[in-house]
Structure formats: C-alpha cells, structure tokens
C-alpha cells in the first residue's frame, strides 16, 4: 500500500514545535511529511480548527525522478506579530486518499510584559471634585497588578495594593500628573501620563443686585479654583428670544451673546448699553490659569421700564372762541416702555397752569373758561411709562382759528376745578 | 487583613542550627518578596537581604553571606531563615517583613512580623 | 553601601507638641525614603514611603517631607501613642540601610 495510507502509519516525520514569547514576537511552525506519489496539500489547525488564512509556505522535494516515488513535503506556518488570539495548539492535517492524519501538536504560547487595554486619559476637572480613572491591563503570564502613581509617587506601597482598575481621586487642588504601572512576573509596563487640568469651580448664586433701564448689576459667589487665583469672570448677557428664550440651563443662546470681563474680586459687574424693557438671559465663567470654569446656567432677567427719551412730536394748537383743539403724534424718541398716555398742561400768562391726563389719545378739545379773553396761553405734553413721564414739549402758543380751516368734532374736555399737579416747566 | 507570624523565641548553644519560619496570610504570598531584618538588643535595624517568593532566588547583604538561609514553603505560605553555626553574635531579635513585588525590591517593607528572639548560650 | 543619619538619637517633648524628626542619606536616594516606627513591645509598622506617602491606617498627623539626600518627619500633634522609636530607611538601592533611630518620649 502507498505510504501514508495505513491508519497506524503517518505520514509526518516532523512535528511542530512550541513557541513562547512576548507580544509581536514573528515566528515560525514547521511540520515535515513524506508520501508516495502526489504530495498532499497541508493544512493547518489551532485548537483542532483549520486555520483558513494561515500565511503558509509548503515546500516538496522529490526524492525520485517517477511521480510515484517518495516526496518530502515541508509546510511552514509564519506567526507575524504574535498576539493572545495566536495562542494554543497548532497541528499540521492531510488527507491522503481516504484518511485523515494529523501531526502531533505544537503549542504556541504567549508571555511577557503586561499589555494596556485600557489607560489614563488627560482630562479637565473642577478644583476639590472627585473624578474616577481607568487603567486595565492584562498577560500572560498572570496575574497582572496595577500600581498607580500621581505625580510620579505611586499610591500604594507595592502593585496589587490600593485601587486597581479604577482609581477614585477625591479631589484635586493642582493639576497632576497620573499614571498606571502594570506588573506581572515578567516585570512592568508603564502607561501614558494622563495630566489632570484642574480648573475652576462652576461660579454660584449669579444675581441681580441692581436694575437701570439700560443696565443690570450683577453678582457672583466663585467657586473653588484650587492653588490657582481667578484672574477674571465672563459674563455673558444675550436677549431672550420673545417669549420663546432659552430655558435657563440650555446650553447656547440663538444668538451672539454680549461679553464682558470683571477683574476679581469683587466678584460683580455692571452690565451697561442694554434695551430698557427687555428680557435677557445671562451667564458667567470664572478663569484661572489653568483655564475657565463652566458656565454657570442661564439666569433670565428683566430691564425695567424707563421714561420715553423725547417729547412728543408735531404739537399743534389752534383755538376758536372758547374751545381749543390740541393733537400730537407719538414720540420719536424711544418709549423705553409701555406707553401708557400722555399729559397736557396749559397756561395764560395770569392763569395758573392746568395739568390733564389725556390717556392714550394723541387729541383733545378744551373748553376754555371765560370768554376766551385769556392771553398768550400756550400748551404743553409730555409722554409717560410705568417709569413716569417723559420730558416735557416745549411750550406751543394757543393759534386763532382761521375760516378754512377744518374744524374735527372732538370730544369737549372740561378744565379741571383743580389742577391735578403743576411743575414749574418754564 | 495581612499578617505576618512568625516562629517563638530559640534559645540554642554555640554551634548549632536554628530555623525561624514566617507565616504569612492575607496576600498572594508569591507576588511579594520576603526581607529578613535583624536587630540587635538596644539597636537599629540591619536588612539581612531578601527572596524572590515568586522564583525562590534568595539575596543576601554582604554580611549575612555564608551561614544564613533564607529558604520558602510555599504551598504553606511560609519563609523560613536558618542559620548555622550559631555564636553569640547572633544573640538578636529577627523579623520578616513583607516588601518588594516579584523581582523588585525597592517597595517599602509595609507589613512586618512580631520578631524572633534567639538566645545562644551554652 | 548608602548611610543613614539619624543624628538625634532621643528626644523628649510633650502632649500636643509639634516633633520633627529628620534623616540624612550619604547619596541622593530619589525620594525611595521610608520611616517605620518601633513601639517598646518590639512591633514594627511602616508610617511614610516615598518621602511622604501615609500607609493605610496612619494617622494624619504624621508627614513626611525633604528630597535628595535631606527628610523629616513630623508629628503635627504628639499623643501618648507616638512614643516609640523612628527608623529612617533607604529604598533606592541595595543593600537596603536604615538609620540608628530616634527614640521619642513624653515629658
């Protein structure tokens, strides 16, 4: 019978042999066999699996001139940059007619200095605020302990002692440096340097301390900052989007916010240039050498009402008999405010000076005391807020009414008993 | 909690042989080396040397070359000194102390036992 | 082999008092200095390593400073159960050497 064909006869005249090494170790698996007639193809199993992409070279050498005379078969199997999952049993398999042979195993095994899966990684983290660290690392050969340092002084009196996997620092007052050394009975490997920024606190209690119609004082409780003073806060202020603003603790405002920094202490800052009757929405960030804090939530605050900034516009008074008719428009000037009416005084050169709320209407019709006799009578009106009344028109002498002109039906307002309130305007 | 126990005292003659064990629990015994301290009535402390409990390879300081022993039982947990030829000299106190990881040494000794006390008269 | 200096073999001092004890090494030692401490019933137990580090179950009051070849202890707050004797001890090479010991007691 050809060689190879007996079940208790196989073909392989050398095995593979065993390879131990550390990680990224290239190496070589070598089986030999010799058969009569056509040379097998030699396949290659780990832990009894063929192995389907295995970097292979096989090699035969006739040992004859005639085709069935013995061949020399050599198949080598390349280990490149060995790794856990290249380890265990490797055997060489034929098929030679109808059997299968299988050599004896070789064992390809792993050992050396510990390997990082995972390890430190540099981050920020507020002044006194725990924070966590990871480190993992693994053999063969195990087991593999862990001995962290901060600042290069390890934590522990030897690896294996103090936190392993995950180490909890309680808080930090410098930025510092940690790492993780890895041991086994190989020796050690140490892991990146992770630094550990340490910045500011996020700052506290961000109020209002005072309000203008166009500035808004604010306050601010720091938070801890570490060995590092503050060197400044930011602040910013933006305008709340019509009703629809941002929520306070949505993390960016729709539009560019207005910036300005406060030298600390005192930690407060006047907010001047804003819109009076307007909502708005600010932040700070306090900074030290390290860098900035995080922004404190958005805080939603109101400019008050002011006074409206002019008088009214285009006065006219035009009078006939004893009635006189006044109308203005709104002022130009900006309201700062809900407009909620305006004022009228007049005044003859021997009355007193009478005052009247008009309301929200821009004429009026007075009926005049006496038979209009009164001289030289000249009318004022002033806007008002909430905030109170605007500045006052300069005084516009009373016209006579000529024939022509249009004379509208208004309502007659009667002169008060009384004037309501006088103010020396002129 | 780790303890380290070690052996009673010895009282022995001139010449002979003692050996003091140290049991240790509370540790993977063969990670950490074994360091051996002696110390003189009223004295300091002298580092005698250390084994390796991870491959048994013993190390001693200049003077403790040549009588002393350290030796291991492992699957006991246990290091053991001996030493021969006893003088008066030797009359001391003994101690293990845990330290150094595998082959490295240079971690402190965080962990010590009781001490042994020999006495060599005759 | 590295020296260790202990030049204060005993001091005495009182309830409450602030003690420094220090240590000299011959050569740097690259901060491997570690302090035990030895009570009169003979037991040994590691306080400081690496300069400063505290073991588990020290007590606050106890530091450790210095680098090169310069360190101290300190006891920021002596009670009765500090009286003891301090050994100093280099880490950074072998053979390992400890200082003589400063032996501390209460007035």
């Known amino acids: 019978a050809p060689r190879g064909t007996q079940a208790e006869e196989s073909p392989f005249v050398g095995n593979p042999g065993n390879i131990t090494g550390a990680r990224g170790l290239t190496g070589t698996l070598r089986c030999q066999l010799q058969v009569q007639g056509e040379p097998p193809e030699v396949h290659w199993l780990r832990d009894g699996q063929i192995l389907e992409l295995a970097d292979s070279t096989q090699t035969q050498v006739p040992l004859g001139e005639d085709e069935q005379d013995d061949w020399i078969v050599v198949s080598q199997l390349r280990i490149t940059s060995l790794q856990l999952s290249d380890t265990g049993q490797y055997q060489c398999l034929v098929f030679l007619g109808h059997q299968t042979f299988v050599s004896q195993p070789g064992y390809v095994g792993l050992e050396g200095l510990p390997y990082f899966l995972e390890e430190p990684e540099d981050r920020t983290v507020a002044a006194n605020t725990p924070f966590n660290l990871s480190c993992q690392a693994q053999g063969p050969p195990e087991p593999v302990d862990l001995l962290w340092l901060q600042d290069a002084v390890p934590l522990a009196t030897a690896p294996g002692h103090g936190p392993q996997r995950s180490l909890h620092v309680p808080g930090l007052n410098k930025t510092s440096s940690f790492s993780c050394e890895a041991h086994n009975a190989k020796g050690v490997t140490t892991s990146r340097t992770a630094t550990i920024t340490v910045l500011p606190q996020q700052p506290r209690n961000l109020h209002l301390v005072s309000r203008q119609p166009t500035e808004l004082e604010v306050a601010w409780t720091p938070g801890l900052s570490g060995i590092y003073p503050l060197t400044h806060c930011t602040l910013q202020a933006v305008l709340s989007d019509d009703g629809m603003g941002i929520q306070a603790g949505e993390p960016d405002p729709p539009e560019e916010p207005l910036t300005s920094q406060a030298s600390v202490p005192p930690h407060q800052l006047r907010l001047g240039s804003l819109h009076p009757h307007t909502p708005y929405h600010i932040r700070v960030a306090c900074t030290s050498s390290q860098g900035p804090s995080s922004w404190t939530h958005w805080l939603p605050v109101e400019t008050p009402e002011g006074v409206p900034l002019g008088p009214p516009e285009n006065i006219s008074a035009t009078r006939n008999g004893s009635q006189a008719f006044v109308h203005w428009q709104e002022p130009r000037a900006p309201l700062q405010g809900t407009l909620l009416g305006y004022r009228l005084a007049y005044q003859g050169q021997d009355t007193p000076e009478v005052l009247m709320d008009i309301g929200l209407r821009q004429e009026v019709t007075l009926e005049l005391q006496g038979d209009g006799s009164v001289s030289n009578l000249t009318v004022c009106v002033a806007a008002y807020t909430a905030a109170g009344d605007g500045p006052w028109s300069l005084p516009v002498p009373l016209e006579a009414w000529r024939p022509g002109q249009a004379q509208p039906v208004h309502q007659l307002v009667k002169e008060p008993s009384t004037p309501a309130f006088s103010w020396p305007w002129w | 909690q780790i303890q380290l126990v070690q052996s009673g005292p010895e009282l022995k003659k001139p010449g002979e042989t003692v050996k003091i064990s140290c049991k240790a629990s509370?540790?993977?015994?063969?990670?950490?080396?074994m360091n051996w301290v002696k110390q003189a009535p009223g004295k300091g402390l002298k580092w005698m040397g250390w084994?390796?409990?991870?491959?048994?390879?013993?190390t001693y300081a200049d003077d403790f070359k040549g009588r002393f022993a350290f030796s291991l039982e492992t699957s006991a947990s246990t290091a053991y000194l001996q030493i021969n030829n006893l003088t008066t000299e030797d009359m001391v106190t003994y101690f293990c102390?845990?330290?150094?990881?595998?082959?490295?040494?240079?971690?402190?000794?965080?962990?010590w036992g009781q001490g042994t006390s020999v006495t060599v008269s005759s | 082999d590295i020296q260790m200096t202990q030049t204060t073999s005993s001091l005495s001092a009182s309830l409450g008092d602030r003690v420094t004890i220090s240590c000299r090494a011959s050569?740097?030692?690259?901060?491997?200095l570690n302090w035990y401490q030895q009570k009169p019933d003979g037991t040994v137990k590691l306080l400081i390593y690496?300069?400063?580090r505290l073991h588990s179950g020290v007590p606050s009051r106890f530091s450790g400073s210095g680098s090169g070849t310069d360190y101290s202890l300190t006891i920021s707050n002596l009670e009765l159960e500090d009286v003891a004797t301090y050994f100093c001890?280099?880490?950074?090479?072998?053979?390992?050497?400890f200082g003589s010991g400063t032996k501390l007691e209460i007035k």
């Open positions: 050569q740097d030692i690259n901060n491997y």
């Open positions: 084994i390796n409990t991870y491959t048994g390879e013993p």
């Open positions: 001890q280099q880490g950074n090479t072998l053979p390992f050497t």
């Open positions: 509370g540790y993977t015994f063969t990670k950490y080396g």
């Open positions: 102390a845990k330290g150094g990881y595998y082959s490295n040494p240079i971690y402190p000794m965080d962990y």
């Open positions: 690496y300069i400063s």
